[in-house]
């Protein structure tokens, strides 16, 4: 289901990534150096910045982040 509208929930942050607010709606997401072999599956549509450096992602499918604007 969809996340409730809330200012107290730390929602939209993929498991094990580090996140911080970027204005009222957006999130900066740092998933660097986590040993990931694929993109995190639960990225918020409100992700403004995504760091995937220092991982093991060898290839990306076409349109790998369809949820992002």
């Amino acid at each position: 289901g969809s996340s409730p509208r809330s200012g107290v929930l730390l929602r939209g942050c993929p498991t094990h990534c580090h996140c911080e607010p970027d204005g009222r709606m957006l999130l900066r997401v740092d998933c660097s150096d986590l040993g990931l072999s694929e993109l995190p599956s639960n990225l918020s549509v409100f992700t403004s910045y995504l760091d995937l450096s220092m991982n093991n992602i060898s290839q990306l499918l076409p349109n790998p982040l369809p949820s992002l604007r």
Epitope: S6, V8, L10, T15, C17, H18, P21, R24
Partner: antibody, heavy 117, light 107 residues
Amino acid sequence: QVQLQQPGAELVKPGASVKLSCKASGYTFTDYWMQWVKQRPGQGLEWIGEIDPSDSYTNYNQKFQGKATLTVDTSSSTAYIQLSSLTSDDSAVYYCARSLSGSVDYWGQGTTLTVSS
Amino acid sequence: DIQMTQTTSSLSASLGDRVTISCRASQDISNRLNWYQQKPDGTVKLLISYRSRLQSGVPSRFSGSGSGTDYSLTITNLEQEDIATYFCQQGNTLPPTFGGGTKLEVR
């Protein structure tokens, strides 16, 4: 700098209602949610609820439904919590705190509410 | 509701010590955890959000770690000004819930 000003103390009789205030300054009031948290003497912290000052949308802890009502006055950048049918169990410190995307980053000093006849 | 447990309610340490305060959630909270410091005068301050993100102005001797249900706050080189009660809080689901607090005292 960011400030959330709360009255230091309130003394109210059992059965009555009280409206506690939290005046915000140093930031754009409607850009952040306002949280309310209860702390009984010597106890932990308990979330009451939250309000989005931009449109007064609220979420409540089910435990405080019917007990607490959250409102805002954007013209004075003030948030309020009204507590009804007061009993000794409502005697506590009540904190307001602003939040954004889950980071509850500034807290008021708290208002000590004493319910006593 | 998710239950947050801080098994150590009080902790005694010496200045300069490395102190670890733990917090356990009743279910996986996916790193959605905040740590707060409450001084004896009641002042509350956010130290760490999203498990490990240090708030601006918070000394680097504070750090947060953990995953799943188990999390910890570490203070290296304990200073007098760190004497306070520390609370964890989950921000994974409504209602957000707090641990019972760990009171840090100087030995």
